[in-house]
């Protein structure tokens, strides 16, 4: 069972001093973010017992294995159900505490009732403040039964539950009709899944015979020991004031465990600590009684004295629960209460015994859960004891359970049961995960889900090139850290597998499924440099670059051009997918922007060194388009263009640019500058006769503006072929801007 204890401080004179503490003795309990241990949870459960809302309770964590709930302001805050959840995975366990108001109309004679399947449970509510109304019994908050107030027997209302089954488990309450729910008597019924003394899926297995009030768990056959007792069968008492599965915890405060209620995993429930009893666990045991709730009687023989915490303290020469065994009777010594081995191992188990006559090798035997008896292979005889060594055959899962070491001499016999846990070495259910890759290394997360048993002590990563017959390389790593596989070959597939181990001999599990991880290409090493660039418009830039000449093939798939706009904090990336390219046209840039430009070679996903950066200023965007452009043929070689100036100009126009193109022609258009910006007409000369032309124009301030609409016009007649169009504005000849 999970080592989880919920402590309730019942010194109830002041609710503000009341606290609940949940303590876990589990390894790694409550580490939270750690994948191997979820946190302890401690909370009030308002689903069944609803109380008026109050200020929120305060939760304080003390280290990794303890959590405390405080902040109760009034007695009604305390009434109800509290739960603590701890343990990981399949071992996650809920411990429940039910708190009754000391001033309630009805009080439970006993809060926790643990019964076996098929038993009759009797819940008894004692009348504390009488009301002459019906008594309503509820189960998990719903109506269950009713009694007339006359039906009280000796001042108690009894609820008999015959032939109880596990679904009958839960919170029961007895309430006077019309009384506040806080005045109810609250009970917790725990019904074990098996009949008395049995456990397991079909209740076929026999419980170990838990001592000192321990309760046999119906799932795993372990004894859940009362607070203050330990051992496989709860046979050992802890020192006064200690609790926990290994007596490792100490009760807080100077008065030890007085005034504390202890709640343990089902099917135990709750009780006072060893040596204490009463509704508030403040009364010491009466003479002759001991243990949790003082439920046990000493009945010491042969001069033994009764200690209320541990039971009979035997005089020299006697031992046993009631000091009934003479020291002449053989006695098993220092037998561990629990042993753990890995599946398919062949462990050695030692069993030591003393007595008079002295035990010899043949008088000590080991009995497995299936009844098989093993005889010792050798014995070590010392003055005060004989230690028999047993070689156990290869362990199987069915060997899990209670083993027994037995010694028999003419002086009598003794036996000691101990639990053997056969653990299954862990096997990964999934392949490791690739986190990042480079040309010569892979970063891998080895932490995967697994079948079998933890804890994980070591993780081995096995790897080798895919389709290789060479030996696997192995690296041993910490379970919680990522692993870097180094010195690998570039652009190579590697088969990678995880192997997990748990503590102990034979704890190595089988290898997990393989996964293919491929290293990256070699990094490109050549650094390009920018040869030059020129602006082809307010938003277009032509860039050219070079690479150093090196022998051998070029390691690269293409180039990445980067433009950094520092003002806006934006980066533009242009991919040139040919490694032979040495020029690129960048379009859609922002006019008037200062860019930092560089180029780098790439190979697969890897980038080579960037070129030294260049700084480029794009001209700002130009003015709006000229309006109402119109073309009129004047002769067989002349066409006149007229237009209106653009509206909303940001500044004075420096020139106009006219574009001339033969309609349907395949050649490049001609650009002609009009350097007199005040003009609104110009004559284009040198055109071919009877030819259809397309015209459009734009203005320039600091940069070229938007194009006007396109107009069409044909020259007249059938004259000679002209040399090419020229422009005249008020008889002034202009050069041709191509």
């Amino acid at each position: 069972a999970v080592d989880l204890t919920l402590l309730a401080n019942l010194r109830l004179t002041d609710p503000q001093r009341f606290f609940l503490t949940c303590v876990s003795g589990e390894a790694g309990a409550g580490r939270g973010s750690d994948a191997w241990g979820p946190p302890l949870l401690l909370e009030k459960d308002d689903r069944i017992v609803r109380t008026p809302p109050g200020p929120p309770l305060r939760l304080a964590r003390n280290g990794s294995h303890q959590v405390t709930l405080r902040g109760f302001s009034k007695p009604s805050d305390l009434v109800g159900v509290f739960s603590c959840v701890g343990g990981a995975g399949a071992r996650r366990t809920r411990v429940i505490y039910v708190h009754n108001s000391p001033g309630a109309h009805l009080l439970p004679d006993k809060v926790t009732h643990t019964v076996n399947k098929g038993d009759t449970a009797v819940l008894s509510a004692r009348v504390h403040k009488e009301k002459q109304t019906d008594v309503i019994w509820k189960s998990n908050g719903s109506y269950f039964y009713t009694l007339d107030w006359h039906e009280a027997q000796d001042g108690r209302f009894l609820l008999q539950l015959p032939n109880v089954q596990p679904p009958s488990s839960g919170i029961y309450s007895a309430t006077y009709l019309e009384a506040s729910p806080l005045g109810s008597a609250f009970f917790r019924l725990i019904v074990r899944g098996c009949g008395a003394g049995r456990w397991g899926p079909g209740c076929t297995k026999e419980c170990p015979g838990c001592l000192h009030g321990g309760v046999c768990h119906d799932h795993d056959g372990e004894c859940v020991c009362p607070p203050g007792f330990t051992g496989t069968r709860c046979e050992q008492a802890c020192r006064e004031g200690r609790f926990g599965q290994s007596c490792q915890e100490q009760c807080p405060g100077i008065s030890g465990c007085r005034g504390l209620t202890f709640c343990l995993p089902d099917p135990y429930g709750c009780s006072c600590g060893s040596g204490w009893r009463g509704s508030q666990c403040q009364e010491a045991c009466a003479p002759g009684h001991f243990g949790a709730d003082c439920r046990l009687q000493c009945q010491c023989q042969n001069g033994g004295t009764c200690d209320r915490f541990s039971g009979c303290v035997c005089p020299s020469g006697w031992h046993g629960v009631h000091c009934e065994k003479s020291d002449r009777i053989p006695q098993i010594l220092n037998m561990a209460s629990e042993l753990e081995f890995n599946l398919e191992t062949m462990p050695r188990i030692n069993c030591a015994a003393a007595g008079n006559p002295f035990p010899v090798r043949g008088s000590i035997e080991l009995r497995k859960p299936d009844g098989t008896v093993l005889l010792s292979t050798k014995a070590i005889v010392e003055p005060e004891k004989t230690t028999a060594e047993f070689e156990v055959p290869r362990l199987v899962l069915a060997d899990s359970g209670f083993w027994e070491c037995r010694v028999s001499t003419s002086g009598g016999q003794d036996s000691r049961r101990f639990k053997v846990n056969v653990k299954v070495p862990p096997v990964p259910l999934a392949a490791p995960r690739l986190l990042t890759k480079q040309s010569r290394q892979l970063v891998v997360s080895p932490l995967v889900s697994f079948s079998g048993d933890g804890p994980i002590s070591t993780v081995r990563l096995h790897y080798r090139p895919q389709d290789s017959t060479m030996d696997w390389s192995t690296i041993v790593v910490d379970p919680s850290e990522n692993v870097t596989l180094m010195n690998l070959r570039p652009k190579t597939g590697y088969s990678v597998r995880v192997q997990l181990s748990r503590p102990g001999e034979g704890g190595e599990g089988a290898w997990g499924p393989p996964t293919l991880m491929t290293t990256d290409c070699p990094e490109p090493l050549l650094q390009p440099w920018l040869e030059g660039w020129h602006v082809e418009g307010t938003d277009r830039l032509r860039v050219s670059w070079s690479l150093p000449l090196v022998p051998g093939p070029l390691v690269g798939d293409g180039f990445l051009l980067r433009l950094w706009d520092g003002t806006r904090g934006q980066e533009r990336r242009e991919n040139v997918s040919s490694p032979q390219a040495r020029t690129a046209l960048l379009t859609g840039l922002t006019p008037g922007t200062h860019y930092q430009l560089d180029v780098q070679l790439y190979h697969c996903t890897l980038l080579g060194p960037a070129s030294p950066p260049a700084h480029v200023l794009l001209p700002p965007s130009g003015p709006p388009a000229p309006r109402h452009l119109h073309a009129q043929a004047l002769s067989d070689s002349e066409i006149q263009l007229t237009w209106k100036h653009p509206e909303a100009l940001p500044g004075p126009i420096s020139k106009y640019v006219v574009e001339v193109q033969v309609a349907g022609g395949a050649g490049d258009p001609l650009w002609i500058d009009v350097d007199r910006p005040e003009e609104t007409s110009t004559i284009i000369r040198g055109l071919n006769a009877s030819t259809r032309y397309l015209f459009r124009m734009r203005a320039s301030i600091q940069g070229l503006g938007d194009w006007s609409n396109t107009v069409e016009e044909s020259t007249l007649g059938n004259g000679l072929q002209a040399e090419g169009p020229v422009q005249e504005s008020r008889a002034a000849e202009e050069g041709l801007d191509q």
């Epitope: 019906d134 908050g141 109506y143 269950f144 009713t146 009694l147 006359h150 039906e151 009709l177």
Partner: antibody, heavy 123, light 107 residues
Framework: EVQLLESGGGLVQPGGSLRLSCAAS????????MVWVRQAPGKGLEWVSV????????RYADSVKGRFTISRDNSKNTLYLQMNSLRAEDTAVYYC????????????????WGRGTLVTVSS | DIQMTQSPSSLSASVGDRVTITCRAS??????LNWYQQKPGRAPSLLIY???NLRSGVPSRFSGSGYGTDFTLTISGLQPEDFATYYC?????????FGQGTRVEIK
């Protein structure tokens, strides 16, 4: 299906006896208070008797006290009403009903009724 | 014993009408009053329990109110299936007692 079914009614002479039965099904009969309620022809409803789940506590209307006995057999899921010294004014349809209490609201009410059985006391 | 008095003993109403039936207890019964509906030849059935709690499956046009000695059953929009006899009943103490009933008829 949750239901109650009365039987045992009929014609009886004044001073005679009759035993009514009420068979319960579809719920845990042994957990509930059960009552008998009667209704004379053309009249209103009159509560007759109650028995608690254990069978250990009963109550009666003054008009039937000493003549009628309510009982139950939880193993058979059956409620009974033994009627002795019958009078003409006992003529009525007799209903058995379950007395229930809500989890939140603390008042008793008759939430489940049988169809009734007619008892006629006449010479 | 606690006496329960209903009024009116009968009333005629049309479909869609708002109908109110009152019930008076001879002593304080807190909120412990229930209402039942009975149709001819049928057993009574629970409508409202403990003053104002609507039984599951009962239409929301039925509502209950009141406290102490005076209680009301209201049908907000009478439907054809609502023509029946209605009884109040106290569950404050034993013996349980019913009102004499109110018959709701079609006008």
């Amino acid at each position: 299906e949750v239901q109650l079914l009365e039987s045992g009614g009929g014609l009886v002479q004044p001073g005679g006896s009759l035993r009514l039965s009420c068979a319960a099904s579809g719920f845990t009969f042994s957990h509930y208070k059960m009552v008998w309620v009667r209704q004379a022809p053309g009249k209103g409803l009159e509560w007759v008797s109650v028995i608690y789940p254990s069978g250990g506590w009963t109550r009666y209307a003054d008009s039937v006290k000493g003549r009628f006995t309510i009982s139950r057999d939880n193993s058979k899921n059956t409620l009974y009403l033994q009627m002795n010294s019958l009078r003409a004014e006992d003529t009525a349809v007799y209903y058995c009903a379950r007395e229930m209490i809500d989890t939140i609201s603390p008042g008793w009410h008759f939430d489940l009724w049988g169809r009734g059985t007619l008892v006629t006391v006449s010479s | 014993d606690i006496q329960m008095t209903q009024s009116p003993s009968s009333l005629s109403a049309s479909v869609g009408d708002r109908v109110t039936i009152t019930c008076r207890a001879s002593q304080n019964i807190n909120i412990y009053l229930n209402w039942y509906q009975q149709k001819p030849g049928r057993a009574p059935s629970l409508l409202i329990y403990t003053q104002s709690n609507l039984r599951s499956g009962v239409p929301s046009r039925f509502s209950g109110s009141g406290y102490g000695t005076d209680f009301t059953l209201t049908i907000s929009g009478l439907q054809p299936e609502d023509f029946a006899t209605y009884y109040c009943q106290q569950s404050h103490s034993a013996p349980r007692t019913f009102g004499q009933g109110t018959r709701v008829e079609i006008k």
